[in-house]
């Protein structure tokens, strides 16, 4: 159950409502837990998790990644630039999260929860951002053809792609969490 939707929150009216930052923090941690569960199934199913860093680096995917210029690291930290990067990155990850939807047997619901919780996180962050004009939304047509191409890959490539998406999304969220805690 995504944060803020469990019955314990409803049954505890004395508890202070979460601040916007706390809610975002809790949402990211919830998604990270979901990714861990998905990674567990992926690693149990194949030996992808032992793949060398070199092989993983040599891929045709264009997954969002934090760079120095994004202003999310301690050195050169820039709140507005960083927030734009986080939101843009999450929007770019959405097509890859859609790809994950048919990639799991026993964790199907978990994959859906990660996808839906990410949509909620984007909404939380958009409310926080002042400069929404700077956020570029991915082109739906480009996303549709990318999704088709990913789904057409051979079995080994699909497993590698799944593993890399989960690993990259985890790293992106961890960097985002650290940066948001500085805001």
């Amino acid at each position: 159950v995504p944060p803020g939707e469990d019955s314990k929150d409803v049954a505890a009216p004395h508890r202070q409502p979460l601040t916007s930052s706390e809610r975002i923090d809790k949402q990211i941690r919830y998604i990270l837990d979901g990714i861990s569960a998905l990674r567990k199934e992926t690693c149990n199913k194949s030996n992808m998790c032992e793949s060398s860093k070199e092989a993983l680096a040599e891929n045709n995917l264009n997954l969002p990644k934090m760079a120095e210029k994004d202003g999310c690291f301690q050195s050169g930290f820039n709140e507005e630039t960083c927030l734009v990067k986080i939101i843009t990155g999450l929007l770019e990850f959405e097509v890859y999260l859609e790809y994950l939807q048919n990639r799991f047997e026993s964790s199907e619901e978990q994959a859906r929860a990660v996808q839906m919780s990410t949509k909620v996180l984007i909404q939380f962050l958009q409310k926080k951002a002042k400069n929404l004009d700077a956020i570029t939304t991915p082109d739906p047509t480009t996303n549709a053809s990318l999704l088709t191409k990913l789904q057409a890959q051979n079995q080994w490539l699909q497993d590698m792609t799944t593993h890399l998406i989960l690993r990259s999304f985890k790293e992106f969220l961890q960097s985002s969490l650290r940066a948001l805690r500085q805001m």
Epitope: A55, N60, Q151, Q153, N154, Q155, L157, Q158
Partner: antibody, heavy 120, light 111 residues
Framework: EVQLVESGGGLVQPKGTLRLSCAAS????????MNWVRQAPGKSLEWVAR??????????YYADSVSDRVTISREDSQSMLYLQMTNLKTEDTAMYYC???????????WGQGTSVTVSS | EIVLTQSPPSLAVSLGQRATISCRAS??????????MNWFQQKSGQPPKLLIY???NQGSGVPARFSGRGSGTDFSLIIHPVEEDDTAMYFC?????????FGGGTKLEIK
């Protein structure tokens, strides 16, 4: 020993229907994606259709040239692969091969083929 | 779809010499450190037989005379030394993504 034996080919009139079968043995059929590939007389090879495994939701894929006229299916309990072909055209005349696909997308084992002739 | 252009369409090589067949892909068939290019031999009246998989690995029971090389978009099948029994059609095939595609074929003749 891996064996793939096709059947069901023959002479059929244009707009006719045919169902090809492939009996697989010598491997765990349910863990492999399977394909149909055809070869017109004196021509190159042309991939027709593919079905993946249960763990991949039995997804199916088709060549654009046949997508609205053929259906690939599998019966894991019987180790059988099928290709249902409708509204056949003269250009569908070919040898049809049942082919196993490995984890890396390699078409590693081929049956002897079944011949399909579409003619009036 | 990934288009494979094979050359030459036919080739005549003297016994014991080297035969080289090329295959060019319209886009890279390489990802995560592997090139998904395969080579098949087809003798008259027979189904294709796998010779080389993932660019350079020999299929089961394939003689060492057959080797594959290349990466990305450009690949070649080398047969050396050529034997009488190698008279056949040779096809390249990409297994990176569906639709699986094949080259137009090369007819090898032994002089």
């Amino acid at each position: 020993e891996v064996q793939l034996v096709e059947s069901g080919g023959g002479l059929v009139q244009p707009k006719g229907t045919l169902r090809l079968s492939c009996a697989a043995s010598g491997f765990s059929f349910n863990t492999y994606a399977m394909n149909w590939v055809r070869q017109a007389p004196g021509k190159s090879l042309e991939w027709v259709a593919r079905t993946v495994t249960k763990s991949n939701k039995y997804a199916t894929y088709y060549a654009d040239s046949v997508s609205d006229r053929v259906t690939i299916s599998r019966e894991d309990s019987q180790s059988m692969l099928y290709l249902q072909m409708t509204n056949l055209k003269t250009e569908d005349t070919a040898m049809y091969y049942c082919v196993r696909e490995d984890y890396y997308g390699t078409l590693d084992y081929w049956g002897q083929g079944t011949s399909v002739t579409v003619s009036s | 779809e990934i288009v494979l252009t094979q050359s030459p369409p036919s080739l005549a090589v003297s016994l014991g010499q080297r035969a080289t067949i090329s295959c060019r892909a319209s886009e890279s068939v390489h990802n995560f450190g592997i090139s998904f290019m395969n080579w098949f031999q087809q003798k008259s009246g027979q189904p294709p037989k796998l010779l080389i998989y993932t660019a350079s690995n020999q299929g089961s029971g394939v003689p060492a005379r057959f080797s594959g090389r290349g990466s990305g978009t450009d690949f070649s099948l080398i047969i050396h030394p050529v034997e009488e029994d190698d008279t056949a059609m040779y096809f390249c095939h990409q297994g990176k993504e569906v639709p699986w595609t094949f080259g137009g074929g090369t007819k090898l003749e032994i002089k």
